[in-house]
Interface confidence: medium
């Protein structure tokens, strides 16, 4: 997994009039990291992990940068032609990555009302757009504006590749965001579902990186996909992730079922608690 920094900026218009607020979210290595969500942007670290990365400092620099980016994206939205009545959004997602071999990637993507219409490889400066004619019309709008108004938007559209990588390297140097493996804590719980049946849920939390295999097995054999229900792998606010898988089984057959977990080359199995024992915790190292 490469290290990554991802900026997600969203601005809104109502009946063709661009709204003054904007929303900015920054993700570091896939984790919510900073957020600006007010008219007057204050960069807010998302959880203790983000504060640890940023260190004991104010976030004036991040606030200034994110505010500038928001203003520039608002200007871009103002130049999108033929905005229909009602509420519309322009979103810019900017991503930079540093791979283990120290190679880098940077890209920028524009979405209007949630639909991708323009992307740029920030290293090669190559623009791409979907084939749909609506996307191409929007792309023409934005590219024309960026060309004509390059000076007005210099904070936003110049040296983005370098700036993003510089910030990412700065965050990585904090020592908190190092290539690391954090094993999951696994909990198995049961709850009464209906007469003769119980629902068993296997939860994995506190793990990093996010790739994990979690599934139910009966007599050592994986259950079919359609008999299991999975939760999304979600950040837990501490720089780690959580997820779950559940299935329904017949009461009295608990001993035949185990939760199988695989993460970063390690694996373990976890039985269903029987009787009145509701939770079994096991944390492998």
């Amino acid at each position: 997994e490469p290290h990554s920094l991802r900026y997600n900026l969203t601005v809104l218009s109502w009946d063709g009039s661009v709204q003054s607020g904007f929303l900015t979210e920054v993700h570091l290595d896939g984790q919510p990291f900073l957020r600006c969500d007010r008219q007057k942007c204050r960069a807010k670290p998302q959880g203790q992990w983000a504060e640890d990365v940023l260190g004991n400092k104010t976030w004036d620099r991040e606030t200034r940068d994110l505010t500038g980016n928001g203003k520039d994206l608002r200007m871009t939205l103002a130049h999108i032609k033929d905005q229909k009545e009602g509420l519309h959004s322009l979103q810019e997602i900017r991503v930079c990555e540093i791979h283990e071999d120290n190679s880098t990637r940077s890209s920028q993507h524009f979405y209007y009302d949630g639909e991708l219409f323009l992307s740029q490889n920030l290293e090669t400066k190559e623009w791409t757009m979907p084939q749909s004619s609506r996307a191409q019309t929007l792309a023409m709008n934005v590219r024309n504006f960026l060309k004509e108004d390059a000076m007005k938007t210099k904070t936003h559209y110049h040296a983005m590749h370098a700036d993003c990588l510089q910030e990412l390297r700065r965050y990585l140097k904090s020592g908190v965001v190092l290539r690391r493996t954090v094993p999951p804590m696994v909990n198995v719980t049961r709850s009464e579902a209906s007469e003769g049946n119980i629902t068993v849920t296997c939860r994995a939390s506190g793990f990093y990186p996010w790739n994990i295999t979690l599934s139910w097995r009966q007599d050592g054999v994986s259950l079919s996909h359609d008999t299991q229900q999975w939760g999304d792998v979600l950040p837990d606010g501490n720089g780690t992730y959580q997820t779950w898988v559940a299935t329904r089984i017949c009461q009295g057959e608990e001993q035949r079922f185990t939760c199988y977990m695989e993460h970063s080359g390690n694996h373990s199995t976890h039985p269903v608690p029987s009787g009145k024992v509701l939770v079994l915790q096991s944390h492998w190292q």
Partner: antibody
Framework: QITLKESGPGILKPSQTLSLTCSFS??????????VGWIRQPSGKGLEWLAH???????YYNPSLKSQLTISKDTSRNQVFLRITSVDTADTATYYC??????????WGQGTTLTVSS | DIVMTQSPATLSVTPGDRVSLSCRAS??????LHWYQQKSHESPRLLIK???QSISGIPSRFSGSGSGSDFTLSINSVEPEDVGVYYC?????????FGGGTKLEIK
């Protein structure tokens, strides 16, 4: 009250340049989101969009005619102009200017007729 | 370019009839479809915006429907003053294109 009015030469010879003016009132082309375009209609036929200019001076042209067309504006005088070079008999039509704000042409001028004849 | 096809080319109706005019786009344009009415020796007038949204000052007997690539303009009870040519317009994608028109006549 919003009005638009087109004016032009009326008659031209083939290969000459057509210059059209759209004079409007009741709105300003300096307003964000505002645009004015040109549409033409040969007698007894359908409508063909030609060109459009926006408040920020961004210009759109019909690709099939782009090499012949130039659209411009004078915001302070509330006027939009269209030039078509090298006209021929196929350019004989009524030329309309129309206001466009949120995706549709909501106000149209009365039209000006051009005849191209040698 | 998106090609807009209108049918029928001509429609002869009796006052009081309910009529439907069809417009088809060569690819999906969501609801970015606008209808215009043009009476003889007059300039076009906006009737319906975004497939079904009414326009202030337009009689309520005019309504629009459809989404994607198939659209319909309906006139609830035709009146003699409704004669003219009706055009649909692609407002979705550049270049903006119009249909060939449907001519409405009174028998």
């Amino acid at each position: 009250q919003i009005t638009l009015k087109e004016s032009g030469p009326g008659i031209l010879k083939p290969s000459q340049t057509l210059s059209l003016t759209c004079s409007f009132s009741g709105f300003s082309l300096s307003t964000s989101g505002m645009g004015v375009g040109w549409i033409r209609q040969p007698s007894g036929k359908g409508l063909e969009w030609l060109a459009h200019i926006w408040w920020d001076d961004d210009k759109y042209y019909n690709p099939s005619l782009k090499s012949q067309l130039t659209i411009s504006k004078d915001t302070s005088r509330n006027q939009v102009f269209l030039r078509i070079t090298s006209v021929d008999t196929a350019d004989t039509a009524t030329y309309y200017c129309a206001r466009r704000t949120q995706g549709y042409f909501d106000y149209w001028g009365q039209g000006t007729t051009l005849t191209v004849s040698s | 370019d998106i090609v807009m096809t209108q049918s029928p080319a001509t429609l002869s109706v009796t006052p009081g009839d309910r009529v439907s005019l069809s417009c088809r786009a060569s690819q999906s344009i969501s609801d970015y479809l606008h209808w215009y009415q043009q009476k003889s020796h007059e300039s076009p007038r906006l009737l319906i915006k975004y497939a079904s949204q009414s326009i202030s000052g337009i009689p309520s007997r005019f309504s629009g429907s459809g989404s994607g690539s198939d659209f319909t303009l309906s006139i609830n009870s035709v009146e003699p003053e409704d004669v003219g040519v009706y055009y649909c317009q692609n407002g979705h994608s550049f270049p903006w294109t119009f249909g060939g028109g449907t001519k409405l006549e009174i028998k």
